[in-house]
């Protein structure tokens, strides 16, 4: 084979090229980009070996090894303003072509933190020593350089080019020379794998003779994951050599004919491919033994096969057909599981919604949350439900137990609350007195006062304006009522004092109970009814000391 002009190694689905050049990292990246690549990644030990191989090729082409350390840019960089992260293998650096933060690293020494400038990584090589497979080049971090000032000891860079697939090298069955030209404009005669979209020029013959013939092939995709040249039979075959030259270019067996011709063949369990050179395992899947969407996977040496089902399906007893997996058998969901063909879905009970830690988890819907409370006043969230409550002076109402209705204390079952007149208000009540009487300081009793004509004492209501003439009782004639302290058990009987703060219609107490003085009587706080979302059932009163708060939407929410 002729001498290669550039250093190139191809393996897997990528090629690596190494280049001399005292350039900044940005200039090196631009040169890689021009041919469709990037500065090389070194994401695994295997990739580190490929990069080392291509650098070894480059060093072999340097006439004299010089006793110095040299650095070669790779595609690992950290942007200005991004700080070192010692907990990560890449220490906060990232690959220029993108890609995940990989676990492999090979740092030369502990990194110093510097966030003020962009930092770039190079491979550190001792140029006076041949590269040994066991000693992979270390990563050195430093400034990225600038045009004309690449940085200390920068000698070159490594590019990486990724491909959809690779073709095998062309096999020659007689004397000749193959030259590959890659899509990244590199020529080589000794690639172990040739990248997709490369061209191959084959010049047959000894080189100095006129009988040389030439062939031209392109590495193309012929079928899924099948990359091939489209050549048929060994190239440059010569009756003079038969099977003696490079096994006739055959992958496995070479059979000579009496007339100097020869054919390639394959060992048992293998078949000859379209190129009439390469052997591949016989495909036991060719008879399509797998059913029901199963994929047939050939076994080793083409002797047997296994059927593989898509996700969510499993092989039946025949091991040939796919049937749906009932994932719900494994209880993957927190609450309800619905099996579907090839999959399943999790659902949540009423009062719950998807969310929380883990797959298929459900979390309680906070029905009392800001803006969504269904309650008119107080709302208490419960696991999977909620209940509504009302402030003092109101009782739960409505079919679903979410509304609050004013209690008319003046006609309540507890008997007369006022000695004389009773004014119901929203959520409370007030007492008043007939003309000639004034309200006692307790806000309930009436005491004989100065004689006056006019309506009963107590503030007039809008509803009654103009109905009666006369003046209202001065403020001194009314007492400020007080409620029992917050948190008083609702079932505990307390003396309830009327509120005098708002207008209300007047309710007259029946004549037989009117008296100028006397006990205000006992008043029982109304029960708070707890309504659950599911049933609407009422719970017994007691024990609820939650604080009602006003929501943005005008409803009472509590939690």
């Amino acid at each position: 084979t002729g001498a290669d002009t550039e250093a190139v190694v191809c393996a897997g689905t990528a090629c690596y090229t190494a280049h001399w050049g005292k350039l900044s990292a940005a200039e090196a990246q631009n040169l890689c980009l021009q041919n469709g690549g990037n500065l090389a990644t070194v994401k695994s030990e295997e990739e580190a070996q490929h990069v080392q191989q291509v650098l070894a090729q480059l060093l072999r082409r340097e006439a004299a090894l010089t006793a110095r350390m040299g650095k070669f840019w790779i595609g690992l960089q950290r942007e200005k303003g991004k700080c070192l992260d010692p907990s990560l293998p890449l220490k906060g650096f990232s690959w220029v072509g993108g890609g995940e933060d990989t676990p492999y690293s090979n740092w030369h020494k502990e990194l110093r933190n510097s966030c003020i400038s962009k930092r770039c990584v190079s491979l550190l090589l001792d140029l006076s020593q041949p590269l040994l497979p066991g000693r992979l080049p270390k990563w050195s971090e430093g400034p990225c350089g600038s045009p004309g000032s690449p940085g200390s000891n920068i000698e070159g860079f490594v590019c990486k080019f990724s491909f959809k697939g690779m073709c095998r090298p062309l096999a020659l069955g007689g004397p000749g020379q193959v030259t590959y030209t890659t899509p990244f404009q590199t020529t080589s005669s000794s690639l172990e794998a040739v990248p997709f979209a490369s061209a191959a020029n084959v010049a047959c013959g000894e080189g100095d003779k006129d009988d040389s013939q030439s062939h031209y092939f392109l590495c193309k995709e012929k079928a899924p994951d099948v990359f091939d040249w489209g050549s048929s039979g060994p190239l440059c075959v010569s009756p003079k050599y038969g099977c003696n030259f490079n096994n006739g270019g055959c992958h496995q067996d070479c059979f000579e004919g009496g007339d100097g011709s020869f054919l390639c063949g394959c060992r048992p369990g293998f078949r000859l491919l379209d190129d009439l050179v390469t052997c591949a395992s016989r495909n036991p899947c060719s008879s399509s033994p797998c059913r029901g969407g199963a994929t047939c996977i050939p076994g080793p040496h083409g002797k047997n096969y296994t059927c593989r089902c898509p996700q969510g399906y499993q092989l039946d007893s025949s091991q040939l057909d796919c049937v749906d997996v009932d994932e719900c058998q494994d209880s993957p969901c927190a609450q309800e599981c619905v099996n579907t063909p090839g999959s399943f879905r999790c659902e949540c009970w009423v009062g719950y919604e998807p969310g929380g830690p883990g797959e298929g988890a459900c979390q309680d819907v906070d029905e009392c949350a800001l803006g969504r409370s269904p309650c008119a006043q107080g709302c208490t969230n419960t696991e999977g439900s909620f209940h509504c409550s009302c402030e003092e002076g109101y009782v739960l109402a409505g079919e679903d137990g979410t509304q609050c209705q004013d209690v008319d204390e003046c006609v309540g079952p507890g008997g007369p609350l006022c000695d004389s007149l009773c004014f119901n208000t929203q959520g409370s009540f007030r007492c008043g007195c007939l003309p000639g009487w004034v309200l006692a300081p307790n806000g309930v009793s009436c005491a004989m006062g100065p004689v006056s004509l006019g309506p009963p004492s107590g503030p007039p209501d809008e509803e009654y304006k103009g109905e009666r003439e006369g003046s209202t009782v001065p403020p001194a004639a009314t007492a400020s009522p007080t409620r029992g302290p917050e948190g008083t058990p609702k079932s505990t009987p307390t003396t309830r004092r009327p509120l005098l703060s708002s207008d209300a219609p007047i309710t007259s107490v029946p004549l037989e109970v009117l008296a100028p003085s006397g006990s205000p009587g006992l008043w029982r706080e109304p029960s708070i009814h707890h309504t659950t979302a599911a049933s609407g059932a009422q719970e017994p009163a007691g024990g609820d000391s939650s604080v009602a708060t006003q929501n943005d939407d005008g409803t009472d929410g509590q939690k």
Epitope: K164, F217, L218, G230, C290, T295, P310
Partner: antibody
Framework: QVQLQQSGPELVKPGASVKISCKGS????????MNWVKQRPGKGLEWIGR????????DYDGKFKGKATLTADKSSNTAYMQLSSLTSEDSAVYFC??????????????WGQGTLVTVSA | DIVMTQAAFSNPVTLGTSASISCSST???????????LYWYLQRPGQSPQLLIY???NLASGVPDRFSGSGSGTDFTLRISRVEAEDVGVYYC?????????FGSGTKLEIK
């Protein structure tokens, strides 16, 4: 834009041969597979084979081997299909179809307008 | 060879409603890479075929998103969410997992 221009209709006698053409324009002709597809009147589509003009690599459906021969001329950006030993079964519209990406085998987003070949005595 | 099977006619559909066309193959078209090599083409009357869907579920360039493809390894469906008058024609499924590449016999979309 990509265009595939096919040659005009052909009326040929049984036993004769015919060579129809498909000229590609608006793209790098030599780096895309050119496929040929047959459609008999009122019938479905049948893949005949394909050629890669860059190196002349060809593939055929077995039942068209010996019937169809695919060639390409890079200098004129033209693919050809020669049909030999024609019978009435060969009367059909023949389409050329180009693949979507260079060097790749699938799919067929670009089609010629079709060439009608009629075999009749 | 892989055989692709299609019904000759679809159920008649009303314009603006959805339509589904089915296709099945004698062998799974799911490749070990995870790609399913199934394609849908539409041939309108008197025209060349037009690529709609490639690799089972990918919408071809310039095709309205009313079209969608789905399926398993051997059973496939082309769905048109809101049928328009211009959708009339014959729909072909095709496989490109193995050579020779093969087409279904075609399903004619019928409008009520």
């Amino acid at each position: 834009q990509v265009q595939l221009q096919q040659s005009g209709p052909e009326l040929v006698k049984p036993g004769a041969s015919v060579k129809i053409s498909c000229k590609g324009s608006g793209y790098a002709f030599s780096t895309y597979w050119m496929n040929w597809v047959k459609q008999r009147p009122g019938k479905g589509l049948e893949w005949i084979g394909r050629i890669f003009p860059g190196d002349g690599d060809t593939d055929y459906d077995g039942k068209f081997k010996g019937k169809a021969t695919l060639t390409a001329d890079k200098s004129s950006n033209t693919a050809y299909m020669q049909l030999s030993s024609l019978t009435s079964e060969d009367s059909a519209v023949y389409f050329c179809a180009r693949t979507g990406a260079a060097y790749e085998f699938d799919p067929f987003p670009y089609w010629g307008q079709g060439t009608l070949v009629t075999v009749s005595a | 060879d892989i055989v692709m099977t299609q019904a000759a006619f679809s159920n008649p559909v009303t314009l603006g409603t959805s339509a589904s066309i089915s296709c099945s193959s004698t062998k799974s078209l799911l490749h070990s890479s995870g790609i399913t090599y199934l394609y849908w083409y539409l041939q309108r009357p008197g025209q060349s075929p037009q690529l709609l869907i490639y690799r089972m579920s990918n919408l071809a360039s310039g095709v309205p998103d009313r079209f969608s493809g789905s399926g398993s390894g051997t059973d496939f469906t082309l769905r048109i969410s809101r049928v328009e008058a211009e959708d009339v024609g014959v729909y072909y499924c095709a496989q490109m997992l193995e050579r020779p590449f093969t087409f279904g016999s075609g399903t004619k979309l019928e409008i009520k």
